[in-house]
């Protein structure tokens, strides 16, 4: 058993049929010595008396808010949550496996630049009685500070018969050094509590590996005289690290119709302009990627050919 | 060329070669990116490699103030990785495929280090840790880790030279 926060405790249980469970001793936070009784949740049934209560925690019915009282007055609470371990593996019932970029990916994180700011998100089908708490650091043995905000519900989607809820959190490294080569990864830890179930999820990454620039901005077309060709120009996204002579991007320019199966024109460039062949009913799209490190491409920025 | 005395390097040449190094480092192991090597433990294997750190003057302001600190750090790293790529970690079993870009990568690391420090000038170089894994699978894992680390190192070096070529070239 360990303390998650004040008056909230996590009991770690090996979860299998007829498991013996864990013996837990609760102590009433009071100077009083006698006349103390214990109850669980809203029930008025007295579970025991005395300053301490010893219980055998085996299942969710044994978890919940234990309260010690004296003469009708509440003295203190202890909330017991369960953390299940099945076949040596901690349960992951609360969050959905996003399976990208690999199986057992529950947390996904992205950064728009090298400033040390990043966003993580996760998915669940649970809609109520759900809380999250996020902590982060750079490195684990001698951790350096990363400050995370509160996790918020950022999107709701319907997937078949189910509703899916996306939560996200923004974090910022306290003393980021955008130009340095990272040697210690960022660690992100998410505590998830659904009713009386506790789970924790972790992710470890370098900012450089989660970089995904915003799409290029201000796409403009200029038809070339006596030619089918069009000069397309764009700018670096505002959110990208500066100076651009140092933090450079490379670009992919593509002309394609509405269907992916249609023919296309495609060219890669380090410049912020390119010449392509525009077709009626097609669009010109441009996306960006770090020029020197193969992290994710941005989403496409598009303009119609006409 | 960047000599210890403090003259400027051939920024444009260094830019071209460092960008080539980036391409080679990724083609040497493009799939490394899909392996979470941090899960494999044995941190010490790549903790000894020289990293370009915050105080090394490789940021745009540091380069403007005095690029020598940064260039020396890059030179150290190039020599370090050049020696690693020539060591039995890469020459031992399992043999690299003959078409592996590691050979080109090795030659390009040497080429860039020579551009930075011509014969006859010497910056101090870092000692190579004695990493000689006994098992072929350990060697394979170590190669992946070294290449992954090299990808990050050459990306910073390429940024430095691109910025230098754009803003510091005479």
């Amino acid at each position: 058993i360990w303390e998650l926060k004040k008056d909230v405790y996590v009991v770690e249980l090996d979860w299998y049929p007829d498991a013996p469970g864990e013996m837990v001793v609760l102590t009433c936070d009071t100077p009083e010595e006698d006349g103390i009784t214990w109850t669980l949740d809203q029930s008025s049934e007295v579970l025991g008396s005395g300053k301490t209560l010893t219980i055998q925690v085996k299942e969710f019915g044994d978890a919940g808010q234990y309260t010690c009282h004296k003469g009708g007055e509440v003295l203190s609470h202890s909330l017991l949550l369960l953390h299940k371990k099945e076949d040596g593996i901690w349960s992951t019932d609360i969050l959905k496996d996003q399976k990208e970029p690999k199986n057992k990916t529950f947390l996904r994180c992205e950064a728009k630049n090298y400033s040390g700011r990043f966003t993580c998100w996760w998915l669940t089908t649970i809609s109520t009685d759900l809380t999250f708490s996020v902590k982060s650091s750079r490195g684990s043995s001698d951790p350096q500070g990363v400050t995370c905000g509160a996790a918020t519900l950022s999107a709701e989607r319907v997937r078949g018969d189910n509703k899916e809820y996306e939560y996200s959190v923004e974090c910022q490294e306290d003393s980021a050094c955008p130009a340095a080569e990272e040697s210690l990864p960022i660690e992100v830890m998410v505590d998830a509590v659904h009713k009386l179930k506790y789970e924790n999820y972790t992710s470890s990454f370098f900012i450089r590996d989660i970089i995904k620039p915003d799409p290029p901005k201000n796409l403009q077309l200029k038809p070339l005289k006596n030619s089918r060709q069009v000069e397309v120009s764009w700018e670096y996204p505002d959110t990208w690290s500066t100076p651009h002579s140092y933090f450079s991007l490379t670009f992919c320019v593509q002309v394609q119709g509405k269907s992916k199966r249609e023919k296309k024109d495609r060219v890669f460039t380090d410049k912020t302009s390119a010449t392509v062949i525009c077709r009626k009913n097609a669009s010109i799209s441009v996306r960006a990627q770090d020029r020197y490190y193969s992290s994710s491409w941005s989403e496409w920025a598009s303009v119609p050919c006409s | 060329r960047a000599v210890p005395g403090g003259s400027s390097p051939a920024w444009t040449q260094c830019q071209q070669l460092s960008q080539k190094l980036c391409t080679l480092a990724w083609s040497a192991h493009p799939l490394v990116g899909h392996m979470d090597l941090r899960e494999e433990g044995d941190e010490e294997t790549t903790n000894d490699v020289p990293h370009i750190q915050c105080g090394d003057g490789c940021d745009p302001q540091g380069l403007r103030d005095n690029s020598q600190f940064c260039l020396q750090r890059i030179h150290q790293g190039l020599i370090f990785y050049e020696k690693l790529l020539g060591s039995d970690i890469f020459t031992g079993e399992p043999s690299l495929l003959p078409d592996s870009p590691v050979g080109q990568l090795h030659a390009s690391l040497l080429g860039l280090s020579q551009l930075l420090q011509p014969e006859g000038h010497h910056w101090e170089t870092q000692q190579i840790p004695s990493l000689s894994p006994s098992q072929p699978w350990q060697r394979l894992l170590l190669r992946f880790k070294i290449l992954r680390s090299l990808q990050a190192f050459v990306a910073v070096a390429a940024r430095v030279f691109a910025h230098g070529a754009a803003t510091l070239s005479p």
Partner: antibody, heavy 118, light 107 residues
């Protein structure tokens, strides 16, 4: 199977015009760009131009501008290359090539030898 | 026009050898570079697109690398059917241009 089949060899006199064809099969003709590339005896490859059969848009290499016309007939799934004012240096194998991507060549015809000789 | 220069113009090699052909562009072309193989009397065949992207059905012994102005095609463990002429082609800008070719001959 995507295939391009070209018309047979031609012998022409200097100053004449040649028109060679390229019949596509195994795909929707207008879904691919069609290019013409030539290769003079013992020499390298030379790109001449392309057509988008869907709308008839064309682009020619400056070297051939004014002498070359590329057309496409979507009713017969056939592309054509017409080269006028022939000279001996135009003796070459002429290839048609196609791709969904404009700038490189995925599928090639077998080639048509054009000999220009007086 | 962008000039493409291939080297060497010919190379003699044996079955099992590793052969590397280089291609240099007269200006930076990012990764807009493609490689073809041509056998005598036959049409060219696409081997690699965009400098390093493999083509379905092409043996994995063919690999490409490079960006900017310098590119290479490597044939690992040359097979009898690989003796042919190899061309690079830039697609950075029109007109599309090819290298002069590299003939891989039997030693």
């Amino acid at each position: 199977e995507v295939q391009l089949v070209q018309s047979g060899a031609e012998v022409k006199k200097p100053g004449a015009t040649v028109k060679i064809s390229c019949k596509a099969s195994g795909y929707t003709f207008s879904d691919y760009y069609l290019h013409w590339v030539r290769q003079r005896p013992g020499k390298g490859l030379e790109w001449m131009g392309w057509i988008d059969p869907e709308n008839g848009d064309t682009e020619y290499a400056p070297k051939f501008q004014g002498r070359v016309t590329i057309t496409a007939d979507t009713s017969t799934d056939t592309g054509y290359l017409e080269l006028s004012s022939l000279r001996s240096e135009d003796t070459a194998v002429y290839y048609c090539a196609a791709n969904k991507e404009l700038r490189y060549f995925d599928v090639w015809g077998q080639g048509t030898l054009v000999t220009v000789s007086s | 026009d962008i000039q493409m220069t291939q080297s060497p113009s010919s190379v003699s090699a044996s079955v099992g050898d590793r052969v590397t052909i280089t291609c240099r562009a007269s200006q930076s072309i990012s990764i807009n570079l493609h490689w073809y193989q041509q056998k005598p009397g036959k049409a060219p065949k696409l081997l690699i697109k965009f400098a390093s992207q493999s083509i379905s059905g092409v043996p994995s012994r063919f690999s490409g690398s490079g960006s900017g102005t310098d590119f290479s095609l490597t044939i690992n463990s040359l097979q009898p059917e690989d003796f042919a002429t190899y061309y690079c082609q830039q697609s950075n800008s029109f007109p599309l241009t090819f290298g002069g070719g590299t003939k891989v001959e039997i030693k």
